[in-house]
């Protein structure tokens, strides 16, 4: 139940990331740690790296408010779950600083990719026989 709630939140975050991708030119062009090809059992650790990253509005134009609201939503902490707690204690996961740094566009693309991976794993874990490759 708690894990389900978590994944529903991930699905909503995908929409927020997609919205922010429309405003990449209005974001500070800073390079941010962007996990990619995250190893199994380190997904929550990587997720927290994305949430901690200092994504910022460039404070230009009319989009500042909508961008800041979206960034705030991205940073909202999800409810704690056993899976998340278990992974928190995995000392083998890379630190946030060890991930390659990318500009906002690639940062958001990689964030979305991680969210999709987590939802797909969740969906597949409830199902048998439809995974082909």
């Amino acid at each position: 139940q708690g894990q389900d709630r978590h994944m529903i939140r991930m699905r909503q975050l995908i929409d927020i990331v997609d919205q922010l991708k429309n405003y990449v030119n209005d974001l500070v062009p800073e390079f941010l740690p962007a996990p990619e090809d995250v190893e199994t059992n380190c997904e929550w650790s990587a997720f927290s790296c994305f949430q901690k990253a200092q994504l910022k509005s460039a404070n230009t134009g009319n989009n500042e408010r909508i961008i800041n609201v979206s960034i705030k939503k991205l940073k909202r902490k999800p409810p704690s779950t056993n899976a998340g707690r278990r992974q928190k204690h995995r000392l083998t996961c890379p630190s946030c600083d060890s991930y390659e740094k990318k500009p906002p566009k690639e940062f958001l693309e990689r964030f979305k990719s991680l969210l999709q991976k987590m939802i797909h794993q969740h969906l597949s874990s409830r199902t048998h026989g439809s995974e082909d490759s």
Epitope: Q1, D15, S130
Partner: antibody, heavy 117, light 107 residues
Framework: QVQLQESGPGLVKPSETLSLTCTVS????????WGWIRQPPGKGLEWIGY???????NYNPSLKSRVTISVDTSRNQFSLKLSSVTAADTAVYYC???????????WGQGTLVTVSS | DIQLTQSPSSVSASVGDRVTITCRAS??????LAWYQHKPGKAPKLLIY???SLQSGVPSRFSGSGSGTDFTLTISSLQPEDFATYYC?????????FGGGTKVEIK
Amino acid sequence: QVQLQESGPGLVKPSETLSLTCTVSGGSISSDYWGWIRQPPGKGLEWIGYISSSGSTNYNPSLKSRVTISVDTSRNQFSLKLSSVTAADTAVYYCARSAGVADFDFWGQGTLVTVSS
Amino acid sequence: DIQLTQSPSSVSASVGDRVTITCRASQGISSWLAWYQHKPGKAPKLLIYVASSLQSGVPSRFSGSGSGTDFTLTISSLQPEDFATYYCQQASSFPLTFGGGTKVEIK
């Protein structure tokens, strides 16, 4: 705005292979999930399967033995092959994007494929 | 497979009416339900995902609710462009499945 367009023959003979291509414009196929859904005349929608940008696939078990979905990132296209077709495979075939992994936010208009000799 | 049963299969309504469509799942699917609008010859359109989240660009007269096995799509004030067939889809487990559809017709 992402747009999808199905293309392929509208008539396929029984026992042959149905082949359709979906061309994606207004966005890159190198992220998200890309799926096929069909609707037989007068019936509901049926999910056929999908492929991720990395090439991993999920198929409907009822069709799995006959279905292949592949992706061509260089052409921004993905394809459906359905082998050994029968009249029951006559349907409007839709391609669609799934950003959320399990729901479909952009669809093509659909293409009618009739299986008949 | 998870079966989805929509009711009613069709509904006649007038512009300005409040329309409610229900979708019942054969087993609990938490909030993993989407709603689509489909007009003949057009591409289906995602309205609602995870039971109650409004897809970007969809008018606020559309709303979704429910969890577990019982879900509802509500159109608060029917507009001329809303006459179409509506489908629910479960996103809880593979294979992804759709309801049989509800046709909203002009009274």
